[in-house]
Amino acid sequence: AESCTSRPHITVVEGEPFYLKHCSCSLAHEIETTTKSWYKSSGSQEHVELNPRSSSRIALHDCVLEFWPVELNDTGSYFFQMKNYTQKWKLNVIRRNKHSCFTERQVTSKIVEVKKFFQITCENSYYQTLVNSTSLYKNCKKLLLENNKNPTIKKNAEFEDQGYYSCVHFLHHNGKLFNITKTFNITIVEDRSNIVPVLLGPKLNHVAVELGKNVRLNCSALLNEEDVIYWMFGEENGSDPNIHEEKEMRIMTPEGKWHASKVLRIENIGESNLNVLYNCTVASTGGTDTKSFILVRKADMADIPGHVFTR
C-alpha cells in the first residue's frame, strides 16, 4: 500500500494527476461511520469543504483526495478532518515547463560514483494499475529499454551517464490520457572517499589590530565529514576570558566533502594578545594541517612586508 502524505509542504506540477493521502488511514477504516471531511483554504476563501461536486477534477476515495489533474488554482492549504484528528498540507502548484520534458523545480538530485553501481527504476506504486506504459528519457531523449512497464537502468556508472533522467508514466482515467513525470539529476563524481584535509589560505597570517578593539580570526578548511577543526592558543586554552571560539559552520560541497569554518573571536585586545601564535588545526586519520595567526599592532605595520597581511 502507498504510504501516506506526511510532508506538510508539497510542490507539484500543473497538469499531472496528484493525490493527498492522510496518515490515519487504518484508523479511518475501523470507524466507518465517523464523518470524514476534506477542506481547502486559499487566500480568498476560508475552509471550503471539498467533494466531487465542487470540481470534476476531484475524486475522494477512502483516505485519498485525488486531482485529475492538479491545476494552478489548486494551490492552497488542504485539511483532512475526522473526529479529533486533523492533518494539514500546504500545496504549491507550479507551472509546467512547456519547452522541456521536465520542470526544473521538480527534480531530485543524486550523486553517483564513477565505476560503481548506477540504477534508475521507473515505478509509481499508487497509479500502478492505471499505467499503460512508462518511458525513460535522458536529457529529454527517449531511451529504448526492454521493459516498457517499468523501464530500468542498471549499470556501472560512467561520466557520460551524467544528465537528467525522466520517468514518464502514461495512464488513462475516465477516457482521458494523463502523464506523470519524475526526473532525477544524476551527477557522476570520481569518488567520495576521504581526502587529505587542507586549510585554506596562507600558513602564516599577520593581522593588524588596535588595542581595546575586537578581532575575528576565520579559519576555513576543506575536509571529510568526520574530521575536526580546532583552535590552539596560549599555554592553556580557555585561560583568557576575552577569547571565544565560535560555533563551527559547515557546508557540503557538490563532491560530498565539507567546507568548514571556525572563528576565534578576541575581544578587547590587550598587549598580551600581540605577537603570540593563534594556531588553527584540521585533523583527520589522513593527517593534520595547521595555520597560524599573529596579531600585530597597527603602528608596527611598517616593519612587515605588505604581502603577509590578511584582512
Partner: antibody, heavy 118, light 112 residues
Framework: QVQLVQSGAEVKKPGASVKVSCKAS????????MHWVRQAPGQGLEWMGW????????NYAQKFQGRVTMTRDTSISTAYMELSRLRSDDTAVYYC???????????WGQGTLVTVSS | DIVMTQSPDSLAVSLGERATINCKSS????????????LAWFQQKPGQPPKLLIY???TRESGVPDRFSGSGSGTDFTLTISSLQAEDVAVYYC????????FGQGTKVEIK
C-alpha cells in the same frame, strides 16, 4: 611502455593474510583505476574489486567484502591487495589490471601465485 | 551478477581454418543511450596474463591482428579467428563490464 610488475609467489597457512603488490610504470599511476582479478588453478577469472589510485577510493566485489583491502602508495606508483583469513580455496594467481577509463582492462600484471596450504 | 556462458568449452581447428567462439550473457549488456555493448574478449596463453583483444564487442585493440573479430549484440556474442595460426593456441575469455565485471568460463582453442 606501460608495465605492471607484481610481487613474487607466496605460500601461506590457512587463516593468515597475504599482501600482493603491483608496481606501475610507463603512465601516470593516479590517472587510471586499478582492478584485481584472480584465477584459481585451471579455473576462470574472477573480479575482486578496484582502487582509484588518485584518492584511495575502493569498490570490492560482494564475495570479498570484509576480507579484501586495496591500498596504494602514489610515491612509488604501487597498488596493493591484501586478502585476510585465507582458506585453501584462495589458492590462485592474483592479477592487477589497469582500467583504461572505459571500464575494460587494457594492461595486466604478470600475476602472483598465492598458495594456501597447511 | 550477470552470468557469462561460453561455448564450446574447447575447440580444435586446422591451421588456416576459421575458429568461432560464442558467448551468451544472462541479461543484455547493450545500452541504448550510447549504442554500446559492454563486452570484451581476452586471450590467455599458458603462464601468461590475459591480453585484451576486443572491446565494445567489436572494436579491435591496437596491435591485435585483423584475423580476430568480434560481433553480436544484446546477449549473444561471437569471437571469430578467420584463419587460425599456431600462435593463436590459447584460452579465450569473454567479459562483460556492464554491471560489475564477470567473465565467461573460457574456451580452449587447439590445433587439429
Amino acid at each position: 611502455q606501460v608495465q605492471l610488475v607484481q610481487s613474487g609467489a607466496e605460500v601461506k597457512k590457512p587463516g593468515a593474510s597475504v599482501k600482493v603488490s603491483c608496481k606501475a610504470s610507463g603512465y601516470t599511476f593516479t590517472g587510471y583505476y586499478m582492478h584485481w582479478v584472480r584465477q584459481a588453478p585451471g579455473q576462470g577469472l574472477e573480479w575482486m574489486g578496484w582502487i582509484n589510485p588518485n584518492s584511495g577510493g575502493t569498490n570490492y566485489a560482494q564475495k570479498f567484502q570484509g576480507r579484501v583491502t586495496m591500498t596504494r602508495d602514489t610515491s612509488i606508483s604501487t597498488a596493493y591487495m591484501e586478502l585476510s583469513r585465507l582458506r585453501s580455496d584462495d589458492t590462485a594467481v592474483y592479477y592487477c589490471a589497469r582500467d583504461m577509463g572505459d571500464l575494460f582492462f587494457d594492461y595486466w600484471g604478470q600475476g602472483t601465485l598465492v598458495t594456501v596450504s597447511s | 551478477d550477470i552470468v557469462m556462458t561460453q561455448s564450446p568449452d574447447s575447440l580444435a581447428v586446422s591451421l588456416g581454418e576459421r575458429a568461432t567462439i560464442n558467448c551468451k550473457s544472462s541479461q543484455s549488456v547493450f545500452y541504448s543511450s550510447n549504442n554500446k555493448n559492454y563486452l570484451a574478449w581476452f586471450q590467455q596463453k599458458p603462464g601468461q596474463p590475459p591480453k585484451l583483444l576486443i572491446y565494445w564487442a567489436s572494436t579491435r585493440e591496437s596491435g591485435v591482428p585483423d584475423r580476430f573479430s568480434g560481433s553480436g549484440s544484446g546477449t549473444d556474442f561471437t569471437l571469430t579467428i578467420s584463419s587460425l595460426q599456431a600462435e593463436d593456441v590459447a584460452v579465450y575469455y569473454c567479459q562483460q563490464y556492464f554491471i560489475t565485471w564477470t567473465f565467461g568460463q573460457g574456451t580452449k582453442v587447439e590445433i587439429k
